[in-house]
């Protein structure tokens, strides 16, 4: 419904708004103030998103997908502001929104291109598959398709397998790398160019340690300064691999400065933790403690994995008794 008086047609201008999945956004639109304001927001020029005229909303013909998700800035309309507050955007909301505003003297159309991105925090995992060792960088939900790059000892690797499953709203991506027999350090970067978000996973293999039964072992875990920021919330987990699966020995949450220890022979030095050093001690070693020990430092922006291989050998006493 637009007034039938003589009016000026103002050509369209366009802007881009980037939203994140499930967040609230504003689609901006302005016009030269005037009386008898009529506002129609449409999606892809066909679905009715929001209508306002005669001083109030008229949502009877609003497309059901927008129900209870849109509102105008009502006290700003008289100042030429027809922006739409849009709640809880989904990937299905991506596209072109057109705002038609009519007043007693003119009709204007503004186009807003809404792009929606998703970037659930990725993870870097270490897995044993039979005799092979794999590093896997994965992200459960991401959109648009991310850029994944691998480096070995800071040199880019061209081999980059990507296992991708798509759903209605986003991609789930796994990028495995076979690192069997390698002592190199590895780095995986996942970048969402739309949201300008980057996550990095870094893997470091430490030299193997040979220890005697009933001795203790100190395993280092110090974050690389390039990624680590002590102001950022992060979690540190120490785990031990036994027959292909990891069991958690202890973890630390920076937000609460809480340490949870599941193995009585495990110890953490509180003073070192305060200096962002998460090295640990395992006391009174026995033969079954042989294996791989993994330190995982994770935040929203990175995962730092450090792996130690520990070989526990029988002490001379035990050997002579046998």
């Amino acid at each position: 419904i637009f007034p039938l008086a003589f009016f000026i047609y103002v050509p369209m201008n366009e802007q881009i708004v980037i939203g994140r999945l499930d967040e609230d956004i504003i689609l901006p639109s302005s016009f030269e103030r005037g009386s008898e304001v009529v506002i129609h927001w449409k999606y892809q020029d066909s679905y009715k998103v929001h209508s306002y005229y005669k001083g109030s909303d008229h949502l009877e013909s609003q497309d059901p997908r927008y129900a209870n998700r849109t509102s105008l800035f009502y006290n700003e309309i008289q100042n030429g502001n027809a922006s739409l507050f849009f709640r809880r955007v989904s990937l299905l909301d991506e596209g072109i929104y057109t705002c038609y505003v009519g007043t007693a003297i003119q009709v204007i159309t503004n186009k807003v291109v809404l792009k929606v991105g998703v970037f659930l925090t990725p993870v870097m995992k270490y897995e044993k598959r039979n005799t092979n060792s794999f590093l896997i960088c994965s992200v459960l939900s991401v959109y648009p398709r991310p850029i994944i790059t691998w480096k070995m000892d800071n040199t880019p690797i061209s081999e980059n397998n990507m296992e991708e499953t798509g759903s209605l709203d986003s991609f789930s991506i796994n990028s495995p790398l076979n690192i069997t027999g390698s002592n190199s350090s590895y780095e995986c970067t996942i970048e969402n160019s739309l949201l300008k978000q980057t996550w990095t996973g870094r893997w470091t293999m430490k030299d193997g340690l040979h220890k005697m039964q009933s001795e203790h072992v100190s395993l280092s875990c110090q974050p690389v300064n390039d990624y680590f920021s002590p102001n950022q919330d992060f979690k540190v987990t120490w785990s031990r691999m036994k027959s292909g699966t990891f069991s958690v020995l202890a973890y630390y949450l920076s937000s609460s400065q809480n340490t949870i220890i599941n193995e009585s022979r495990f110890s953490w030095n509180k003073e070192l933790i305060n200096q962002s050093d998460f090295s640990m001690n395992l006391m009174d070693l026995n033969l079954s403690d042989s294996g791989e020990y993994l330190c995982n430092i994770s935040s929203d922006e990175y995962t730092l994995l450090t792996i130690h291989t520990v070989h526990v050998e029988p002490s001379q006493e035990t050997a002579s008794h046998n």
Epitope: Q15, V17, I18, R20, D22, E23, D24, I25, I26, P28, S29, S30, A67, N68, S71, L72, F73, Y74, N75, E76, N81, S83, F85, R87, R88, L195, K196, Q197, Q232
Partner: antibody
Framework: EVMLVESGGGLVKPGGSLKLSCAVS????????MSWVRQTPEKRLEWVAT????????YYPDSVKGRFIISRDNAKNTLYLQMNSLRSEDTAMYYC?????????WGQGTTLTVSS | DIVMTQSHKFMSTSVGDRVSITCKAS??????VAWYQQKPGQSPKVLIY???TRHTGVPDRFTGSGSGTDFTLTISSVQAEDLALYYC?????????FGGGTKLEIK
């Protein structure tokens, strides 16, 4: 970590002006609408202003419209609130907030006292 | 303007108890309601948005419910650190408005 750090509060006489700043880090500032919310000495919260991600559109409640101006510098990751014609009822703690999932990140606040 | 009313200014509870903080909107706001927690000396933090969705990192003892005009924030087992002011807020229609707050006190 997302950090919002407000500054610029102080003691101002009625009718005076003051400009608050909020330095933002840890998020893609230019992608988000940003807001100011204030808390009165009686602990009531009140939405004060919002600015669109690009900075071209601003929104205010009637209580501050025409007196307060919200602006942003996306190159400097900084949000501003210019407050003019201040009144005693503007005395409050002013918080800079991100508009994402409701007001989902808040700064530590800066205090404005309007008194003669 | 939509008025958000938190009828209890204060609520007293014991550690381990279940407590429900209520909020009433002066008109239908669908599920466009958020809940905030403000601990002494700190800024508010969002706990719940869209009436029932928990914000990242919020313990699962906090639950939001309701739609239309009546909303509830429930803490299933109150902890000492839950001593705080709790606010509801609607973003259904501008101006966005907050409730007056409910102060949770631990006996």
């Amino acid at each position: 970590e997302v950090m919002l750090v407000e500054s610029g509060g102080g003691l101002v006489k009625p009718g005076g002006s003051l400009k608050l700043s909020c330095a933002v880090s840890g998020l893609t500032f230019s992608s988000y609408a940003m807001s100011w919310v204030r808390q009165t000495p009686e602990k009531r919260l009140e939405w004060v202003a919002t600015i669109s991600s690009g900075g071209s559109h601003t929104y205010y409640p009637d209580s501050v419209k025409g007196r307060f101006i919200i602006s942003r510098d996306n190159a400097k990751n900084t949000l501003y609130l210019q407050m003019n014609s201040l009144r005693s009822e503007d005395t409050a703690m002013y918080y800079c907030t991100r508009l994402g999932r409701a007001f989902d990140y808040w700064g530590q606040g800066t205090t404005l006292t309007v008194s003669s | 303007d939509i008025v958000m009313t938190q009828s209890h200014k204060f609520m007293s509870t014991s550690v381990g108890d279940r407590v429900s903080i209520t909020c009433k909107a002066s008109q239908d706001v669908s599920t466009a309601v958020a809940w905030y927690q403000q601990k002494p000396g700190q800024s508010p933090k969002v706990l719940i948005y869209w009436a029932s969705t928990r914000h990242t990192g919020v313990p699962d003892r906090f639950t939001g419910s309701g739609s239309g005009t009546d909303f509830t924030l429930t803490i299933s087992s109150v902890q000492a650190e839950d001593l705080a002011l709790y606010y509801c807020q609607q973003d259904y229609s501008t101006p966005w408005t907050f409730g007056g707050g409910t102060k949770l006190e631990i006996k």
